[in-house]
């Protein structure tokens, strides 16, 4: 499911519960996706020893995965709500091609991989409603994404395993950073 249980506005199972605010819904959605990533990481870590490798050992890769930096305004130091929100949405849009790559990369967690992908789309929609400056958000070029996807899928098995691990780790870190920032807003 792309939305955590009980999050659908049509859910009537708990009529006395206060409806979630926009911020609470976003917070819960990110935690839901992080749980999904955790399950996917379990499968990849069981298959290879890459999870034990230090970040330095895995740093040499050609992936241009979104990453938070000081200039993005999401850290405690130099925090800027609007700049940060733009970075979070832009970063999530950039991750979408990598989440597409993750589909069919899992045997026992195929549904989980799909749930992470769909939940991220929902999260982007939630965040776009919150953002004031939508013009500043650049959407990735579909043609560039298509060729990137083809290139990633053409890698040998070892590189595909490495790519899967790096995507999951980077996406987890990006979401954790985003959550810390959103909780300051």
């Amino acid at each position: 499911a792309p939305v955590p249980p009980g999050e659908d506005s049509k859910d009537v199972a708990a009529p006395h519960r206060q409806p979630l605010t926009s911020s609470e819904r976003i917070d819960k959605q990110i935690r839901y996706i992080l749980d999904g990533i955790s399950a996917l990481r379990k499968e990849t870590c069981n298959k290879s020893n890459m999870c034990e490798s230090s970040k330095e050992a895995l740093a040499e890769n050609n992936l241009n995965l979104p990453k938070m930096a000081e200039k993005d305004g999401c850290f405690q130091s130099g925090f800027n709500e609007e700049t940060c929100l733009v970075k979070i949405i832009t970063g999530l849009l950039e991750f979408e091609v990598y989440l597409e790559y993750l589909q069919n990369r899992f045997e026992s967690s195929e549904e989980q991989a799909r749930a992470v992908q769909m939940s991220t789309k929902v999260l982007i929609q939630f965040l776009q409603k919150k953002a004031k400056n939508l013009d500043a958000i650049t959407t990735p070029d579909p043609t560039t994404n298509a060729s990137l996807l083809t290139k990633l899928q053409a890698q040998n098995q070892w590189l595909q395993d490495m790519t899967t691990h790096l995507i999951l780790r980077s996406f987890k870190e990006f979401l954790q950073s985003s959550l810390r920032a959103l909780r300051q807003m």
Epitope: R31, S54, K55, M68, Q76, E173, Q176, L179, R183
Partner: antibody, heavy 117, light 110 residues
């Protein structure tokens, strides 16, 4: 797996001091690291945390005076403008970074910093 | 800024007693709360995280409950090695806070 703090000593007020947290049996690059201090006979006081290589967060009292930095094997706590109120045992602790909430599941034994003239 | 208030600050109990310590957050922190045990001259030790999940190697006489703003640590049957100071810690947000920890509860022998 263990953590060890070093660098604690007797210093005079105003002297800068750097404490170092060293990991054994694992790489710090895969974890978040926090610093916590405890004045004699008092409770635990959270100082700050380093997440990745450059994201940090600090307690309001630590902002501007304390700086946390990280390499693959060590995490440093740089302290400036020290006063007698900074006299405490300083602990570093590891957060396994697997979840979104901060929790510290591996601690060093602490290093004592005494600020006195 | 989130503040953590722990009570009582100290209590006296006997071996075999049921002991309850409470912790209150100034705003909702979901279930993102941990409990630590500290003995004199030693580093703190993680007992419980996510409000109710027992850390590895922690005896089952320790339990945690709560969500939102109100949390409880319970020791069902106090053992001699349980006399120590206990701290709660919020892990919800470490930005713009004075302290992530509660003030502590010292459990002494009656």
């Amino acid at each position: 797996q263990s953590l060890e703090e070093s660098g604690g000593r007797l210093v005079t007020p105003g002297t800068p001091l750097t404490l170092t947290c060293t990991a054994s049996g694992f790489s710090l690059s895969n974890y978040y690291v926090t610093w916590v201090r405890q004045a004699p006979g008092k409770g635990l006081e959270w100082i700050g945390i380093i997440y990745g290589s450059d994201e940090t967060a600090y307690a309001t009292s630590a902002i501007g005076r304390f700086t946390i930095s990280k390499t693959s094997t060590t995490v440093d706590l740089k302290m400036t403008s020290l006063t007698a109120a900074d006299t405490a045992t300083y602990f570093c602790a590891r957060d396994d970074s697997s979840d979104w909430d901060a929790k510290f599941n591996l601690w060093g034994q602490g290093t004592l910093v005494t600020v006195s003239s | 800024a989130i503040q953590m208030t722990q009570s009582p600050s100290s209590l006296s109990a006997s071996v075999g007693d049921r002991v309850t310590i409470t912790c209150q957050a100034s705003q909702s922190i979901n279930n993102e709360l941990s409990w630590y045990q500290q003995k004199p001259g030693k580093a703190p030790k993680l007992l419980i995280y996510r409000a109710s999940t027992l850390a590895s190697g922690v005896p089952s006489r320790f339990s945690g409950s709560g969500s939102g703003t109100d949390f409880t640590l319970t020791i069902s049957s106090l053992q001699p090695e349980d006399f120590a100071t206990y701290y709660c810690q919020q892990g919800y947000s470490l930005r713009n806070i004075d302290n992530a920890f509660g003030g502590g509860t010292k459990v002494e022998i009656k």
